[in-house]
């Protein structure tokens, strides 16, 4: 489920990591496009044993999982993901 | 040839503790997500822990949270379970087994040959 | 937790027979399915993974399809050595194996 996710105007992420996770412990997905007072995208993942680690949006990675996902956003997802809407 | 070996399975008595390792051969180890499963006649499989590729992020099933902890030594190729407060229901063959890889390929799933261990009085 | 609902548990056939063997899903579970064989005290064996890619040097008479909630192991054409016990397997959100169907010579 595609739901908008409203922040403040500024970047989340001190720190990103590009290793690699598998779906099935991810909790939950949230992408913050650039802008909003952050100048890059930023992408926020959940994971089932409660902690929370930024993504590098190049991550070969990340950018196939966000593909099936949302080849699959017309039915339910397992990891909902979250958009930031820029006014 | 790639291979897993399980040891340090064992009789316990119920509030004991054990540790199981397991040693591997034959892939890279760092390169692998980890993950401990075990079997009873009863309740089939069941995954127990899974271990990121560093020993940086565990993941338990609800039942042995607080009890177990999942860890490894990837200079020594060597994955560990350390069991507490064990209870009867945890009686049960422990395998460990591969899981992706560094990239997210999940090509090779291997098992070593399985721990024993009983919960007892 | 998802919980995955195998049948049959007990299946008689004969070498040649064609089987299948059945698992439900609580919930879709994205085609993240595996089968597993596994022979008496020896550790499970992966047959598929993915719903449908064959593992390698697993014989071509094994196949599996489904998506949604819905998956199957097919075996085209029984073997002797194919009498053991099979496991299905979810890994969409964390790991539930079923539990178990065992084939058996009629």
């Known amino acids: 489920v595609l739901e908008v996710y409203y922040t403040s105007l500024r970047c989340r992420c001190v720190q990103e990591s590009s290793v690699f996770i598998p779906r099935r412990f991810i909790d939950r997905i949230q992408i913050l496009p650039r802008g909003n007072g952050c100048p890059r995208k930023e992408i926020i993942v959940w994971k089932k044993n409660k902690s929370i680690v930024c993504v590098d949006p190049q991550a070969e990675w990340i950018q196939r999982m966000m593909e099936v996902l949302r080849k699959r956003s017309s039915s339910t997802l397992p990891v909902p993901v979250f958009k930031r809407k820029i006014p | 040839e790639v291979q897993l070996v399980e040891s340090g399975g064992g009789l316990v008595q119920p509030g004991g503790s054990l540790k199981l390792s397991c040693v591997v051969s034959g892939f890279t180890f760092s390169d692998y997500y980890m993950a401990w499963v075990r079997q009873t006649p009863t309740k089939g499989l069941e995954w127990v822990a899974s271990i990121n590729y560093d020993g940086g992020d565990t993941y338990y099933r609800d039942s042995v949270k607080g009890r177990f902890t999942v860890s490894r030594n990837n200079a020594k190729s060597s994955l560990f379970l350390q069991m507490d407060s064990l209870r009867s229901e945890d009686t049960a063959t422990y395998y460990c087994?591969?899981?992706?890889?560094?990239?997210?390929?999940?090509?090779?799933?291997?098992w070593g040959q399985g721990a024993s261990v009983i919960v007892s009085s | 937790d998802i919980q995955m609902t195998q049948s049959p548990s007990f299946l008689s056939a004969s070498v040649g027979d064609r089987v299948t063997i059945s698992c439900k899903a609580s919930?879709?579970?994205?085609?993240?399915l595996t089968w597993y064989q596994q022979k008496l005290g020896k550790a499970p064996k992966r047959l598929i993974y993915n719903t449908n890619i064959l593992q390698t040097g697993i014989p071509s008479r094994f196949s599996g399809s489904g998506s949604n909630t819905d998956y199957t192991l097919t075996i085209s054409s029984l073997q002797p050595e194919d009498f053991a016990t099979y496991f299905c397997?979810?890994?969409?959100?964390?790991?539930?194996f079923g539990a178990g169907t065992k084939l058996e010579l009629k």
């Open positions: 919930q879709n579970i994205n085609k993240e």
């Open positions: 087994k591969t899981e992706e890889d560094y990239d997210g390929s999940y090509v090779m799933d291997a």
């Open positions: 397997l979810q890994q969409s959100s964390l790991y539930t």
